[in-house]
Interface confidence: low
């Protein structure tokens, strides 16, 4: 008799794929055209990335460091009108893209939370949550919560308002902290909070270090849903050398939780390559004309247009991973088991019941390595086969779809492999 199928977990929309942050509308759209109407025209691009949610803004009125001139219910006229926002929401809904609004109050100022007037600000946030929930947003983000006194209790209250309106609404909190204890204390008092932090921001050194960070985090948070990113707002290139971007894309899309990216991560957007551009929000490179300041500074392969035309580009990899992440049960909500594969490597299995299983092997080092995949670390339910089919490599040159012998696996420097194999009773 066939074994009984495992009961599927309840899946919220943010469990099904990546979130995409557009913190600076003007930088995202470029050419001084950064407004909500223009963003509406970019929704097809977001659809092509198969992201599930757009984290937008802040876009509310905020006069730097002035509480009285900060209105979380009003859209800054530079970004457009409430009608523009409603129109964006409707268009996004049609394309199955959820919209999360960033309500970090003093986003133009020194302290995001006007440290001397916490209660006033907290009331403003509470009012704003109710207002924007009625307007149809799918969730909220608040950043820099390390600057918010009594953050845990405020987050609990805001979470209650958000979930009270609908279980289908999401609250994201962001912190610059990379300290696991601080992160856990924020999560403890807020059951369904999605927290972005700098926890993984210094993980780029070795496979062992990354493995230990990831497994510590997952062990500490138990079975609660988490998010994966390298920071609450910044680009991957702020933390990673170019040669690790593909590896991190593969990892972030295949760890258990919601991957969260900033605009430009999908093309390896790097402020350092664009003289005069701010590190936190460089101009998005749609094509070679997006950065006219220095002729020739932008080549086609740095842009959305150039990379869209190249099946081997970082953008193409992002799209493929995003697609896999959103449709494979084992990647959507499968169990996770990390295991030893040798120095410099981080490897793990994702599996769900009798569905196709996935093996991820990541070489963080700058030398080629042979992977000694020791299944001794793995429970019987997640045992490794002798061979697995190569779904994709972060580096070109391998024949996709071909079976690879796991005992003889060799990885190029900075190469990541995503392999698939069937469930075997």
């Amino acid at each position: 008799r066939a074994p009984r199928c495992r009961e599927l977990p309840a899946q919220k929309w943010w469990h099904t794929g990546a979130l995409y942050r557009i913190g600076d509308l003007q930088a995202f759209q470029g050419h001084g055209a950064g407004n909500l109407a223009g963003l509406k025209g970019r929704l097809d691009y977001l659809s092509s990335l198969k992201v599930k949610g757009l984290v937008l803004g802040p876009i509310h009125k905020n006069q730097k460091d002035d509480v009285a001139q900060t209105d979380l219910l009003q859209i800054d006229p530079n970004f457009g009108s409430k009608e523009d926002f409603d129109s964006l929401l409707q268009s996004a809904k049609k394309k199955s893209i959820r919209v999360i609004l960033d309500l970090t109050p003093n986003y133009r100022g020194e302290n995001s939370w006007f440290s001397t007037q916490v209660d006033t600000v907290a009331t403003k946030v509470k009012d704003a949550l109710e207002f924007w929930l009625q307007a149809g947003v799918d969730g909220f983000q608040v950043r820099d919560i390390e600057n918010l006194k009594d953050a845990s209790s405020f987050l609990a209250e805001w979470q209650n308002i958000t979930k009270g309106f609908s279980e289908d609404r999401l609250l994201i909190a962001g912190t610059n902290s990379s300290d696991l204890q601080q992160i856990l204390s924020l999560l403890e008092s807020n059951k369904d909070l999605l927290l972005t932090s700098s926890y993984l921001s210094d993980s780029g050194s070795t496979g062992e270090h990354t493995k230990s960070l990831v497994t510590q985090y997952l062990n500490a948070t138990g079975n609660r849903w988490c998010s994966w990113s390298l920071s609450q707002a910044r680009l991957l290139t702020s933390f990673l050398p170019a040669q690790l971007l593909r590896l991190y894309q593969l990892m972030l899309f295949t760890l258990p939780g919601t991957p969260v990216f900033s605009y430009g991560d999908e093309i390896g957007l790097d402020a350092a390559a664009l003289p005069g551009q701010p590190m936190e929000a460089p101009v998005m490179l749609w094509d070679e004309s997006s950065f006219p300041d220095i002729p020739g500074a932008v080549s086609a392969n740095m842009t959305v247009k150039g990379q869209s035309e190249d099946p081997g580009s970082l953008l193409s990899l992002f799209r493929r991973l995003s697609d896999q992440r959103s449709k494979e049960r084992s990647l959507l909500h499968g169990d996770f088991h990390a295991f030893s594969a040798g120095p410099g490597l981080f490897s793990y299995i994702r599996h769900w019941d009798q569905n196709e299983r996935f093996l991820v092997v990541l070489n963080f080092g700058d030398v080629g390595l042979s992977a000694g995949l020791q299944a001794s670390d793995l429970p019987a339910s997640a045992s490794l086969p002798a061979k697995a089919d190569l779904l994709l490599s972060t580096q070109p040159g391998r024949e996709e779809g071909s079976p690879l012998e796991l005992e003889r696996l060799k990885l190029e420097p900075h190469e990541g492999l995503l392999l698939r194999f069937p469930y075997a009773a």
Epitope: A297, S299, N301, G306, E309, D310, G312, P396
Partner: antibody
Framework: QIQLVQSGPELKKPGETVKISCKAS????????MNWVKQAPGKGLKWMGW????????TYADDFKGRFAFSLETSASTASLQINNLKNEDTATYFC???????????WGQGTSVTVSS | DIQLTQSPSSLSASLGERVSLTCRAS??????LSWLQQKPDGTIKRLIY???TLDSGVPKRFSGSRSGSDYSLTISSLESEDFADYYC?????????FGGGTKVEIK
């Protein structure tokens, strides 16, 4: 192993049409773009353009717009170059070469010689 | 379009000799440069990509380097199979462009 195998040499008259094929093996053709490169006798290499093997969309260099057409038969893992209304100056060896950004033109076909003569 | 100026256009050298070929880019190409070898029978093989990364299977006597907008291919000790034409290729932007080539002949 990865190979690009091109069709054999062609002798044509001016005004005729030629179609050169390039069969890819050892990898999935849709994962890499395909470039075409011209080399006139005794001369250097000249990029003609490329075809996005995932979408089928061709891009032509300025000097190769009009009489030149790239096509694709994905099921046969084959890319093709067709030259219409042949001229004497089309006499050359034509190469196919696969492409991804950081690994552009890492594998090449052996070349197909096209001679146009009346 | 980005021009690649390759020099010298030809050189004669003896077996075991060290030779260097240069390629200068007319605009910034950020290291997006490859070196190709074309044998007398017409077959083309890529030797180096990203300015200095050796393709797998390419002998270690070949090396690539960059200094500003000048890119070099060095063969540390010429062997008989190295006598061929060498081209540089930029893939920083479209259209892709090649250098004019360097013919390496036996002295």
């Amino acid at each position: 192993q990865i190979q690009l195998v091109q069709s054999g040499p062609e002798l044509k008259k001016p005004g005729e049409t030629v179609k050169i094929s390039c069969k890819a093996s050892g990898y999935s053709i849709t994962n890499f773009g395909m470039n075409w490169v011209k080399q006139a006798p005794g001369k250097g290499l000249k990029w003609m353009g490329w075809v996005n093997t995932y979408t089928g969309e061709p891009t032509y260099a300025d000097d190769f717009k009009g009489r030149f057409a790239f096509s694709l038969e994905t099921s046969a893992s084959t890319a093709s170059l067709q030259i219409n209304n042949l001229k004497n100056e089309d006499t050359a060896t034509y190469f196919c070469t696969r492409s991804v950004i950081t690994y552009t033109m890492d594998y090449w076909g052996q070349g197909t010689s096209v001679t146009v003569s009346s | 379009d980005i021009q690649l100026t390759q020099s010298p256009s030809s050189l004669s050298a003896s077996l075991g000799e060290r030779v260097s070929l240069t390629c200068r880019a007319s605009q910034e190409i950020s290291g997006y440069l490859s070196w190709l070898q074309q044998k007398p029978d017409g077959t083309i093989k890529r030797l180096i990509y990203a300015a200095s990364t050796l393709d797998s299977g390419v002998p270690k006597r070949f090396s690539g380097s960059r200094s500003g907008s000048d890119y070099s291919l060095t063969i540390s000790s010429l062997e008989s199979e190295d006598f061929a034409d060498y081209y540089c290729l930029q893939y920083a932007s479209y259209p892709r462009t090649f250098g004019g080539g360097t013919k390496v002949e036996i002295k």
